[in-house]
Interface confidence: medium
Amino acid sequence: TPWSLARPQGSCSLEGVEIKGGSFRLLQEGQALEYVCPSGFYPYPVQTRTCRSTGSWSTLKTQDQKTVRKAECRAIHCPRPHDFENGEYWPRSPYYNVSDEISFHCYDGYTLRGSANRTCQVNGRWSGQTAICDNGAGYCSNPGIPIGTRKVGSQYRLEDSVTYHCSRGLTLRGSQRRTCQEGGSWSGTEPSCQDSFMYDTPQEVAEAFLSSLTETIEGVDAEDGHGPGEQQKRKIVLDPSGSMNIYLVLDGSDSIGASNFTGAKKCLVNLIEKVASYGVKPRYGLVTYATYPKIWVKVSEADSSNADWVTKQLNEINYEDHKLKSGTNTKKALQAVYSMMSWPDDVPPEGWNRTRHVIILMTDGLHNMGGDPITVIDEIRDLLYIGKDRKNPREDYLDVYVFGVGPLVNQVNINALASKKDNEQHVFKVKDMENLEDVFYQMIDESQSLSLCGMVWEHRKGTDYHKQPWQAKISVIRPSKGHESCMGAVVSEYFVLTAAHCFTVDDKEHSIKVSVGGEKRDLEIEVVLFHPNYNINGKKEAGIPEFYDYDVALIKLKNKLKYGQTIRPICLPCTEGTTRALRLPPTTTCQQQKEELLPAQDIKALFVSEEEKKLTRKEVYIKNGDKKGSCERDAQYAPGYDKVKDISEVVTPRFLCTGGVSPYADPNTCRGDSGGPLIVHKRSRFIQVGVISWGVVDVCKNQKRQKQVPAHARDFHINLFQVLPWLKEKLQDEDLGFL
């Protein structure tokens, strides 16, 4: 390391602490250090060391307490299955390297559940699910032996228990003891054995957290059975009079640091957005803590179910708020949650027993004051009458999720706090805040939400097409005439919406190239559908050389688009998707959407332009109030329109107008931007309100966008609210739910 002999602010020298094959970084102002190894390697024998009061670093001790002279990075191996009941696995080996595969086979009479083939992953964990060979003879199905664990107990009758153990030096995550319950499910959650270097990958966390959260939020119809071999999902019939409280608890102690604190806030903002996308309106409680907790939002506040307002409160929290008292008192923080849950005078309000509570705790590790927080979890369980009645344990009414961030996380502590539910994971350990941010971006992006319109992946690692996943590039090759470039927007799995003027009637489908998601390959086109009223020559006799009314077209693709992080649809007006995106009630009408998106005023909007091979968002204002008339009148400065007596001859009610210098100097569109979407960005979602059609001034002569443009440089866009009948007709099979 470049600073190997520098002295940290603590009192331990850095001489001789280097790790072979890796590096180290100081934590907690020099009071601890973390060894960092390349991907696929782990620090041996320990990942972290602490600076002792004697001025020396904690000893390098192996799991069997042998002292090692120098730390080194060793290749990560995955554990071998200690036992596999009622079947075999191949190949057998004392350990497995990253990317090794093992596969499982059941003896005759037994059926395989889980993953038949599993691969050793770079984080030292096996891919897939625990393989289990079961003959269905027990009251409960065989709970399995997760790789690396040992199971005691092989009777699966009602009330039988099994216990799990880990080898020395590994920490058990999940339930050590599981009991066969009424209904054939096992209590608790599947255990696993964790080494200190093991982290959950963002993808694993996103999937596991989301599937558990979805169970909590969505509520599955109680009549639904479960297929053979499936674990029974927990079933909650959402009582219309029931409700949900989500408590966000954020560690703001010294060791977190300002940038991590900001990262954690971003994660929670994404979480709020995600929950809102399900159409539920929970009440939020918001607590940050260090030595003492600070309640920012109480669930009892009127606005606590207003996602936008809660997000605003969250964004306004400052890391400095805990600066002077910077211990880590998790117990006090959970007591603050308890205080929000409890009711005045101990008189439970009507419906208390129908409210479900979700606690989401983000911490970087060790509580160092205030005592064991698990006692508060026990008090909360008591308060909510959970686990007291065997016939109705009410476990579904409390979910505690714990996100441990970084190397100092005490796995035993966070596991103790988290809920343990069959087939669900409530405790997560991620490498760093960047990984946690990844989790919440991926979570917003899970397959269920891939079809959600107007969603973007606003991540620090995101590419242009992560940020504009609807954007399509269109080019038309015309032999001997060069080619025309346009933009478009993905509106469904089969359609791209663009401008009609990008094409001529002579253009053949094979000469039209469409690409999405930044991909090099072009999509095959089935047909281009023009608006029937579009006719560029429609007013030639009246001396109007080009007439752009109804300048919209839909490109129908031959093959269905595969949605992903860089390809997904934009929202269209007057669809159910837009109702949900704007968080409006399901009964919202098309007119109400119009009032929300295009009120009679200057409306902040944006379009996407390509500059030097990069997509950039350009902020403009749609003149829809008192500036609308003057905006439209400037059309007379367009080439060929100078002789037009009545400007409404060319600027029909189908157009929206942007550009000019008031209220702000708007950037202008260029030729290649034609057909692209004019977008309103609301509640973190993107709704297309127009299609870029034509401009008064060509501000992009010689491929360069001019900085100084005249005040009359205006742009005109087809207003999608004005072509809805046509959109509705052509997109009727696309499941967009037009209102």
Partner: antibody, heavy 120, light 113 residues
Framework: EVQLVQSGAEVKKPGASVKVSCKAS????????MTWVRQAPGQGLEWMGW????????KYAQKFQGRVTMTRDTSISTAYMELSRLRSDDTAVYYC?????????????WGQGTLVTVSS | DIVMTQSPDSLAVSLGERATINCKSS????????????LAWYQQKPGQPPKLLIY???TRESGVPDRFSGSGSGTDFTLTISSLQAEDVAVYYC?????????FGQGTKLEIK
């Protein structure tokens, strides 16, 4: 009836590569691991590695790591074993073999063998 | 790697007599949780690929005559042919699949005396 048919004998110079094919029929090719075993003249059997035709996942014996590549073409139900940087002691009969069930290590079905001779 | 050592290297037995081939592994092939031994026996006749005779140390492959039997556990295993027939002349190999890499014994050549 399960059949594994291998390509014909090959003569190679030291330093060259050889690619032996094994065409499977009579069962679903992607459902069963394919293993390769070799036998030098008058010598015993030596396990080289296996391929999971479904995923393309491979496992090679340490001895051959870096020189052997096992691939498959599921469209024609054929597995391939390529050995590079050939030496004279690579002269052997190379067998493909398949287990009883998906990933069995008991080789119930064998190809007829392909003799590879490495000689300058 | 697990080393498999067969004895004897060659063996001559009269027709109708018992033939015994031994195989010793350098570490136990017994998996305690399943009580199974990860060992197989193969027969190879000249110019042919090997043929599976026995797996799990003692389970006879279907179609294999019952004069062939396997026994043993842990590190010591035996293949027995109770009454030698002329068609049994071949080289016999033991193989372990307890750990990777899977390894074979050096082979035992069985001839008629």
């Amino acid at each position: 009836e399960v059949q594994l048919v291998q390509s014909g004998a090959e003569v190679k110079k030291p330093g060259a590569s050889v690619k032996v094919s094994c065409k499977a029929s009579g069962y679903s090719f992607t459902d069963y691991y394919m293993t390769w075993v070799r036998q030098a003249p008058g010598q015993g059997l030596e396990w080289m590695g296996w391929i999971n035709p479904n995923s393309g996942g491979t496992k090679y014996a340490q001895k051959f790591q870096g020189r052997v590549t096992m691939t498959r073409d599921t469209s024609i139900s054929t597995a391939y074993m390529e050995l590079s940087r050939l030496r004279s002691d690579d002269t052997a009969v190379y067998y493909c073999a398949r287990g009883y069930y998906a990933n069995s290590a008991w080789f119930a079905y064998w190809g007829q063998g392909t003799l590879v001779t490495v000689s300058s | 790697d697990i080393v498999m050592t067969q004895s004897p290297d060659s063996l001559a037995v009269s027709l109708g007599e018992r033939a015994t081939i031994n195989c010793k592994s350098s570490q136990s092939l017994l998996q305690s949780s399943t009580s199974k031994n990860y060992l197989a026996w193969y027969q190879q006749k000249p110019g042919q690929p090997p043929k599976l005779l026995i797996y799990w140390a003692s389970t006879r492959e279907s179609g294999v005559p019952d004069r062939f039997s396997g026994s043993g556990s842990g590190t010591d295993f035996t293949l027995t042919i109770s009454s030698l027939q002329a068609e049994d002349v071949a080289v016999y190999y033991c193989k372990q699949v307890y750990n990777l890499p899977w390894t074979f014994g050096q082979g035992t050549k069985l001839e008629i005396k």
